[in-house]
């Protein structure tokens, strides 16, 4: 649980200012896995890469949220770094 | 619908170079075609912040590169040989998810040839 | 690299034929195929992306199926137009990949 929050935090501390926000809009687009909800606008387009990794495993705990983080940074054209991310949450 | 303008046709001599051109946006593309041959992925580049990725086999002979102002990508192929001969696109990602190519320019025809 | 392997790599039809054309990758690469098509001295055009996302203005008789490694480009009701070549490629990990391309030719 803490290396896959460790891991979504290091990428997301890894993106520049325009590229967090970027995230943040893909985010509340990017399709989900049934059952699981959407983290509102209103509070995700404020939120740091702290408080961001803080809500993405809250809302869809570690696994799910490093899995998402990384498809988001793929939608992003970050495959680097979404495979690190995912490589890290594997270890 | 967005175009994606690309000169026509280049003809070069061995052991030279060629920059190619491409008005675009986004995350630019370059795909390599050989007549009959299926689609090779050179590389990419982001036209907003300038980040590149290679495919290992064309790092040594392509550089990307970025004019913000005219929003125009450049592919310069160095060390040309007869196999180098192919069309060349360029192709932008703009759907926003799963990173497909989604807008192609009409490509550029390269011949190398003495 | 991932490599994205094609088959059949021709196939030879008439008109209103249901056609299916296969896509396997060397590794999980999730949802992240596109299916392309391109006809004679002509760039690439999206057909499919994300595995089952019809781009737009792509006629509903084409249809993306498949995740993990195991894809699919369904063509319900061939029509002349969409004689040409199909290439998948996958999104999921640099470098980009394709296949070598299935051709759809008139029996």
């Known amino acids: 649980m803490g290396r896959a929050r460790d891991a979504i935090l290091d990428a997301l501390e890894n993106l520049t200012a325009e590229e967090l926000k970027k995230f943040k809009l893909k985010l509340l687009s990017v399709p989900l896995r049934e059952g699981y909800g959407r983290i509102p606008r209103g509070a995700l387009l404020s939120m740091d890469a702290l408080d961001l990794t803080d809500k993405l495993v809250s809302f869809y705990a570690a696994t799910y949220g490093a899995e998402l983080t990384a498809n988001v940074l793929r939608d992003m054209g970050l495959q680097e770094m979404a495979g690190q991310l995912q490589a890290a949450t594997h270890q | 619908q967005v175009q994606l303008q690309q000169p026509g046709t280049e003809l070069v001599k061995p052991g030279a170079s060629v920059k190619l051109s491409c008005r675009a946006s986004?995350?630019?593309?370059?795909?390599?075609?050989?007549?009959?041959?299926?689609l090779e992925w050179i590389g990419n580049i982001n036209l907003s912040n300038g980040r590149t990725n290679y495919n290992e086999k064309f790092r040594a002979m392509a550089t990307l590169t970025v004019d913000k102002s005219s929003s125009t990508a450049y592919t310069q192929l160095s060390s040309l040989t007869s196999e180098d001969s192919a069309v060349y696109y360029c192709?932008?990602?703009?759907?926003?998810?799963?990173?497909?190519?989604?807008?192609w320019g009409q490509g550029t025809s390269v011949t190398v040839s003495s | 690299n991932i490599v994205m392997t094609q088959y059949p790599k021709s196939m030879s039809l008439s008109i209103g034929e249901r056609v299916t054309l296969r896509c396997k990758a060397s590794?999980?690469?999730?949802?992240?195929v596109s299916w392309y098509q391109q006809k004679p001295e002509q760039s690439p055009k999206l057909l499919i992306y994300?595995?089952?996302n019809r781009y737009t203005g792509v006629p509903d008789r084409f249809t993306g199926s498949g995740s993990a490694t195991d894809f699919i480009l369904t063509i319900t009701s061939v029509q002349a137009e969409d004689l040409a070549d199909y290439h998948c490629?996958?999104?999921?990990?640099?470098?980009?990949?394709f296949g070598a391309g299935t051709k759809l030719e008139l029996k």
């Open positions: 490629g996958q999104s999921y990990n640099y470098p980009l990949t």
């Open positions: 994300g595995a089952s």
């Open positions: 590794e999980n690469v999730g949802s992240y």
């Open positions: 192709a932008n990602s703009m759907v926003p998810h799963f990173f497909p190519m989604d807008y």
């Open positions: 986004g995350w630019t593309h370059w795909v390599k075609q050989r007549p009959g041959q299926g």
